[in-house]
Interface confidence: low
């Protein structure tokens, strides 16, 4: 399927001009390659009429141009002074030859309709209203006024001043006069439909002295706006229907043969196919609203329509706006899994993609709520503090320049199941949707912290240990201190080479954190976690309370009297042959660890990925003088 997109059908009238926009995928090659417009002949050949290389055919000389807009990946063909000879099949495309990527466009140029010379033309959109002005001479002021619609043979009454109204115009047509002006009457017709288009005659008086005026009413379907979006990206339908429908229910529907199936409306209806990835947002009191859809799929391509009606459903004669959405499968947005699985008490690490060219953009994570019109309150962001109800169990790790940031949620409950969105304040196309599924845990968690009821005593030494299974052996372990601005990874030192995972003793794998001496600032949430290179895995959390020493409590001496370190982290292993430890002080990485791509660890992903990268894990210590090594046998 060609990734080039444009209008399928373009119509105009003789002497007018058209402007045809064609879209192409966002690549530098496409931005700079030749763009062309050619006419298809009976033989299948497509003859170039104009190209971005400067070629212009004789028949287009002086009346056409082609402009490339590389910044929004479109090019526009403008053609003026149209004649009926311009009717035909065309292609807009990219490439050095006319056999490159292209899109078929049908252009139809009609004759200007012949109307009586005094005809007044009114052009209105479907669903809107028209006020027809009917002047008359003063002597016809007392006479009957009327408006009729011309049919083949006769003129069928619409409305007259005796309050006679054609049944199909009841409630829609009004005949009135303004103020004291006795030389003009008006007919207003509301909720216009295609059937209302045609020739009308307004008349005041009877017989040869009657005043008559010819009126041509054209009722147009709105021209669909073209939207070109990448697979997995997001789209916003901005709907502006006008003040007259400000208080009506709003909807967005997708054309399906003859009907338009409602996808979402402001009365709470929502198509299950869009669950978790759609919001409808009223913009203001003027009838404006927008619908945002994330995680675009191939099957989302098509013809969309927004409208307003008290039923929240499409109704003939009510204003509409339309779009043609094209979903480009050559997407720049990486294919990540859209469902992440976790278990109660466990954790998930979610990789959120963003446009790598916007590494400095602010990153956010929000939870999609389906009630009402749908909304997505932000739970955490690079400059947004974690929401209170997620205290101690949610953090966002930003890796500038990489194109991925990571959100970790632990202490999972079944309440956490639902849809979440990754978004930034930059390129809105990169909004992505994740469905989090949480199953009841059927086994012990992979990471376990002891002691579980952690109360540290002020001024003393306090150690917590994080036990991990052998399958995490080759991965880095870390402790971090959680705050509502993130989880501050505690610096580490290299523990040196380790035993091979073949001889891993399931009962003795642990990484410990020592607070020495304990201070009041140490109180709070701490996480123990695993990661492989730039990929975060499981985490578990513990709250450490800090209390004053009560009488009778024993004073615990620090393991190393010279230790200046506030926190020492140790990798505890069975192999006592590891005697030489090289301590490496790592500069503080700031409030967020600079980690890159991440996959969720709630299902099998972790096991599939834990390959034997032995010797790469970091033990952790705040200063080079602190070494606490406990060997368990």
């Amino acid at each position: 399927k060609s990734p080039i997109f444009g209008p399928q059908e373009v119509s105009s009238i003789e002497g007018d001009s058209v402007s045809i926009t064609c879209y192409y995928p966002d690549t530098s090659v496409n931005r700079h390659t030749r763009k062309y417009w050619c006419r298809q002949g009976a033989s299948g050949m497509c003859t170039t009429l104009i190209s971005s290389n400067g070629y212009l055919s004789k028949e287009y000389s002086g009346r056409a141009n082609l402009i490339n807009f590389p910044e929004n990946n479109t090019f526009v063909i403008n053609i003026e002074q149209l004649t009926q000879d311009d009717t035909g099949s065309y292609k807009c495309g990219l490439g050095t030859s006319n056999r490159g990527l292209s899109f078929d466009v049908s252009l139809e140029v009609s004759q200007v309709p012949e109307l009586p010379s005094d005809t007044h033309v009114y052009t209105k959109d479907i669903g809107r209203n028209v006020t027809i002005e009917c002047p008359f001479k003063r002597e016809n002021a007392p006479s009957k006024k009327s408006l009729c619609k011309k049919t083949n043979q006769s003129c069928e009454l619409v409305i007259d001043s005796t309050e006679k109204v054609n049944p199909s115009y009841i409630g829609r047509a009004k005949l009135f006069m303004k103020g004291t002006d006795l030389t003009v009457f008006y007919v207003n017709i509301s909720h216009l439909t295609h059937n209302d288009a045609g020739l009308y005659i307004c008349q005041a008086g009877e017989g040869p002295s009657a005043d008559k005026k010819n009126v041509d009413l054209q009722v147009l379907a709105p021209e669909p706006e073209l939207l070109y979006k990448d697979l997995r990206s997001s789209v916003t339908f901005e709907c502006d229907l006008g003040r007259e429908v400000a208080n009506e229910a709003k909807y967005l529907c997708r054309m399906n043969k003859e009907t338009c199936d409602v996808i979402i409306n402001t009365l709470g209806k929502r198509d299950p196919d869009f669950e978790g990835r759609i919001l409808i947002t009223p913009k203001d009191d003027n009838g404006r609203f927008s619908v945002l859809i994330t995680g675009l799929r191939k099957e989302d391509a098509g013809h969309y329509q927004c409208g307003a009606h008290s039923s929240g459903l499409p109704q003939e004669g009510w204003p509409i706006q339309t779009w043609q959405l094209f979903v480009n499968e050559e997407s720049t947005i990486p294919n990540r899994r859209s469902v992440v699985k976790g278990v109660t008490g466990g954790s998930v690490a979610i990789a959120c993609p963003y446009n790598p060219k916007e590494s400095s953009s602010l990153k956010y994570w929000c939870r999609w709520e389906g009630d009402g019109n749908g909304h997505c309150p932000v739970l955490v962001g690079t400059q947004a503090q974690v929401q209170e109800e997620y205290e101690g169990r949610l953090a966002l790790f930003d890796q500038p320049g990489n194109g991925t940031y990571t959100v970790i949620l632990n202490q999972l409950t079944t309440e956490d199941a639902g849809f979440y969105w990754c978004l930034t304040n930059g390129d809105s196309r990169w909004r992505t949707t994740i469905e989090l599924q949480v199953a009841e845990a059927t086994r012990e968690p992979n990471l376990e912290v002891t002691p579980q009821n952690a109360t540290a005593v002020l001024g003393e030494t306090f150690t917590v240990s994080c036990h991990y299974p052998c399958k995490f052996y080759s991965q880095e372990k870390y402790w971090c201190k959680w705050s509502n601005k993130g989880c501050h990874i505690l610096p580490s030192h290299d523990e040196g080479a380790r035993q091979s995972s073949v001889s891993c003793d399931q009962s003795s794998q642990l990484v410990s954190m020592t607070l020495n001496p304990v201070s009041k600032e140490d109180e709070g949430w701490y996480w123990c976690g695993v990661k492989q290179g730039q990929t975060y895995g499981e985490t578990t959390a513990i709250y450490i309370a800090v209390e004053e020493r009560t009488r009778g409590s024993s004073h615990v001496n620090p393991t190393d009297a010279n230790a200046r370190a506030k926190v020492a982290l140790e990798e505890e292993v069975v192999d006592s042959s590891i005697s030489e430890k090289e301590n490496k002080a790592i500069p503080n990485p700031g409030p967020f660890a600079n980690e890159r791509e991440i996959q969720n660890v709630g299902d099998q992903a972790q096991e599939n990925r834990a390959s034997g990268d032995a010797g790469s894990a970091d033990g952790q210590s705040r200063s080079s003088s602190s070494k606490h090594h406990h060997h368990h046998h």
């Epitope: 916007e358 953009s361 602010l362």
Partner: nanobody, 121 residues
Amino acid sequence: EVQLVESGGGLVQPGGQLRLSCAASGSIASVRDMAWYRQAPGKQRGLVAIFARGGTTHYADSVKGRFTISRDNAKNTVYLQMNSLEPEDTAAYYCNAEVATMFQPGFRDYWGRGTLVTVSS
């Protein structure tokens, strides 16, 4: 809001040179493409040069080899060095930038008010 302010236009003789500057200011979160367009009297506005999001540059055929576009990302500023100017280069030069603001997700096109370049002897 975002403002783009062009400067550096003026009257110059054929064969001469000028350097245009355009600075973007306001509540800017991120700037993607920055470009120069021009519009000669009675003609449509056309692309002169673009400094694309990936750092690539692109020039209209008529200015290749004579004009150079450059950019200072830290200052959100784009420059157009115009050498060997010809009378056909006479036009209003407009700066264009795709900008994401702090308060609105997504990029939008912003335009400057233009600076006039006249090449005449």
